[in-house]
């Protein structure tokens, strides 16, 4: 029997530094988690304990904090280079620079392997994006050789910017004929490695022949054997078993997200290349664990450039950004109205000519709104700035809901009007009407939603049967404020780019920006 | 050395029951299926089944599904194949094999148990 | 159920012969094809698994190859230990099924 040691990461966006428990910002040092320097020095732990290791990650380094706004992908290579990973692939995210900020900063600069069998390049990027990423790489481990396939999620065309002349294959198809080219050269231990989700991840272990691991990334899935270490509760058991179509045993794993925890597995196969056993578990990475210096101080030299970035102008303002709860809380506010736009504008995406844009609704819970920015101040917006108003760290995702299940979420924004609490919803491509003299749970009497499916958009009655997609805060996706009926009844939760960084970007682009208070929200006379 | 060892000779009565063991040694049991085969006298092999001792998973194909029962105790590293309700024709040689899942042959096999029905 | 259909059922030989079996499977098999010897009273045994992978401890002499549906057994010099019946496998789709068998006997 020969046996591998599999430490992984995935999602890991862009938290180089360590974090708090909840991966924002690190507070008190003493409880914090992750980053590359605390995760280095469990790696090489293990490294110098252990004879056959893969450090793999499964795609989504990119977007997440300032580390990436400001360094764009070159502080992925860097770190990534320095912790030896052995391969990576490509996520969703890889593509919110376009593939130049993919190619330039990452695939060029990677002295590891960056895999992707189901992206297909077309038209004159074929030669330009050539040998740079591959659909597998076969390494050798001590004595053995494993080959190792990478998959991305074929949507990211919807969640990213891959451009037209990429082409993302489903999964499965793709995979397998690449699995049988590495069976053909006698490689015998196959690990597919890649970015789409916990249930493709299940369906790629039930389908594709021949492989006999699979670790992934995108849906965040925390699992774990045992008593959880820290407040992520687990999906499943780690690893998590799934038995393919011809029967085999093929263990599923992923680490959660943010570099929290660093997934350790290990497999045991024979000499033909079966599995006959495998276990671990995520291992947190706390403050148990000491940051190693060298990387410390590497991360400390390149944070220099973090500091100086985050007080530079990024756009003006000609009018008050009202980002205050007082009306936040209870009225359509100007600062929910500009958020809410950066956030449609971030996913502009044109797909398909029967659609101007695949998504025109964005939700925002009012008690996510912060800070107002005056623009008193030669109405220069910072980075500072937007951090004061969107403090979490959150990312704004997309999300697909019933109507039923809109109408729901617009009934809970006022179910308790009038308390300053925070579930009041702003919004984008929505024209809301409340009658706050109904009792709660039916004081919506209007809503009229932005059309997707037509070359000039206009508001129709938003239809209870039919599926939508929004973007809103990670933190409503996740059923905050009391939105349960969006975390329960979601269709589909794709995870998307760090708050900040998309009304950042919006603002540069913008350069001036006057957001008004426009008639989005509005209440029925007599009530308000 | 990887071996399987099955149970002895059985005869039996048409409509009554008979299980096989097949005790395995020298590699680790709860990771392969456990496959059993069947001869007829003069006769092919016929797949009828297996086991993963592992966690008790069973596959048994449409001939068989009803009259047969595939168990494992992994303490004593045995798998076990029960076929009920016997014919004269289920009279053959029942083999235990292990199946290598990469390309789901049978590597080694057990040195087959004759089992005669007959009134 | 995917059928596989062996031929010659029977073929007589001598020692030194290139002796040549064949299988057919009802649909493609993609190479899960693999191939047995058993000898009267004993259990068979595994000589090829993935149409061409000698199993180990098995002699040079045989080989195999194919693809999609049609795939062959050869030995390249007869031996007297070879004499024996040879029984193709498919592994690709559940349920696994077996060819009928090639009788090799001494001419």
């Known amino acids: 029997a020969w046996e591998l040691t599999i430490l992984h990461t995935n999602d890991v966006h862009s938290r180089l530094e360590q974090t708090s428990e909840d991966s924002s910002k690190c507070v008190n040092a003493s409880r914090c988690m992750g980053g590359v320097a605390r995760l280095f020095t469990k790696v090489q732990q293990i490294r110098r304990a252990e004879p056959n290791v893969l450090l793999l990650d499964a795609g989504d380094q990119y977007q997440g904090t300032i580390w990436f706004t400001v360094y764009k992908g070159a502080e992925v290579a860097h770190f990534m280079n320095a912790l030896r990973y052995d391969a990576m692939a490509l996520g969703n995210h890889e593509f919110d620079n376009g593939v130049e900020g993919l190619i330039e900063p990452l695939l060029k600069e990677a002295k590891f392997p960056i895999l992707s069998a189901n992206i297909k390049a077309k038209g004159p990027l074929a030669s330009q994006i050539s040998g740079l990423y591959l659909p597998y790489k076969v390494l050798p481990v001590g004595d053995e050789v494993v080959g190792i396939v990478g998959y991305t999620s074929k949507e990211t065309p919807f969640l990213s910017n891959p451009g037209t002349n990429l082409v993302f294959e489903d999964e499965i198809t793709a995979l397998q004929p690449e699995v049988d080219k590495l069976k053909t050269l006698n490689v015998n231990k196959i690990i597919a490695l890649g970015h789409s989700g916990f249930e493709m991840d299940k369906l790629i272990a039930q389908k594709v022949r021949g492989v006999d691991v699979v670790v992934g990334g995108h849906s965040n899935t925390f699992l774990y054997t045992g008593n959880p270490p820290s407040k992520e509760v687990p999906a499943g058991k780690y690893p998590f078993i799934v038995t393919s179509d011809d029967g085999r045993k093929v263990p599923v794993v992923q680490a959660y997200a943010f570099g929290k925890y660093l997934g350790y597995l290990k497999i045991e196969f024979d000499e033909r290349g079966n599995v006959i056993s495998s276990h671990g578990n995520p291992i947190l990475l706390n403050s148990s664990i000491p940051e190693d210096p060298s990387i410390k101080a590497d991360i400390n030299k390149w944070r220099i450039k973090l500091d100086n970035y985050s007080t530079q102008e990024l756009g003006k303002t000609i009018v008050y950004l009202d980002g205050s709860s007082q009306s936040c809380r209870f009225r359509e506010c100007n600062m929910g109205n500009l958020i809410c736009d950066a956030m449609i504008n971030n996913n502009l995406r044109h797909t398909d000519e029967m659609f101007w844009n695949h998504v025109s609704m964005c939700i925002l819970n009012g008690g996510g709104i912060r800070s107002p920015i005056d623009e008193r101040n030669n109405g220069t917006i910072t980075w500072e700035n937007l951090a004061a108003v969107l403090p979490f760290g959150g990312t704004f995702d997309l999300v697909q809901l019933k109507g039923s299940t809109l109408k729901k979420a617009f009934e809970h924004s006022v179910h308790r009007y009038g308390q300053s609490t925070g579930e009041f919803l702003q919004v984008g491509g929505i024209h809301v009407v409340y009658d706050l003299s109904r009792k709660p749970g039916d004081r919506v009497v209007k809503l009229d939603v932005l059309c997707t499916k037509c070359r000039v958009p206009s508001y129709d009655p938003l239809k209870m049967d039919e599926v939508y997609k929004v973007i809103l805060p990670n933190f409503l996706a996740n059923g905050g404020d009391g939105f349960q009926m969006i975390k329960d009844e979601l269709l589909r939760h794709d995870s998307g780019d760090q708050d900040i960084n998309v009304v950042s970007t919006y603002i540069s682009k913008m350069k001036v920006i006057y957001p008004a208070v426009e008639g989005r929200i509005k209440f029925s006379t007599g009530s308000h | 050395q990887v071996q399987l060892v099955q149970s002895g000779a059985e005869v039996k009565k048409p409509g009554a029951s008979v299980k096989v063991s097949c005790k395995a040694s020298?590699?680790?049991?709860?990771?392969?299926?456990i496959q059993w085969v069947r001869q007829a006298p003069g006769q092919g092999l016929e797949w009828m089944g297996a086991i993963y001792p592992g966690d008790e998973d069973t596959r048994y194909t449409q001939k068989f599904q009803g009259r047969v029962t595939m168990t494992a105790d992994t303490s004593i590293s045995t798998a076990y194949m029960e076929l009920s309700r016997l014919r004269s024709d289920d009279t053959a040689v029942y083999y235990c094999?292990?199946?290598?899942?990469?390309?789901?042959?049978?590597?080694?096999w057990g040195q087959g148990t004759t089992v005669t029905v007959s009134s | 159920d995917i059928q596989m259909t062996q031929s010659p059922s029977s073929l007589s030989a001598s020692v030194g012969d290139r002796v040549t079996i064949t299988c057919r499977a009802s649909?493609?098999?993609?190479?899960?094809l693999n191939w047995y010897q058993q000898k009267p009273g004993k259990a068979p045994k595994l000589l090829i698994h993935?149409?061409?992978r000698l199993h180990s401890g098995v002699p040079s002499r045989f080989s195999g190859s194919g693809s999609g549906t049609d795939y062959t057994l050869t030995i390249s010099s007869l031996q007297p230990e070879d004499f024996a019946t040879y029984y193709c496998q498919q592994g690709d789709t559940l349920p696994w099924t077996f060819g009928q068998g090639t009788k090799v006997e001494i001419k």
């Open positions: 993935y149409t061409s």
């Open positions: 020298g590699y680790t049991f709860t990771g392969y299926w």
């Open positions: 649909q493609d098999i993609s190479n899960y």
């Open positions: 094999a292990r199946g290598n899942w990469d390309d789901w042959d049978f590597d080694v």
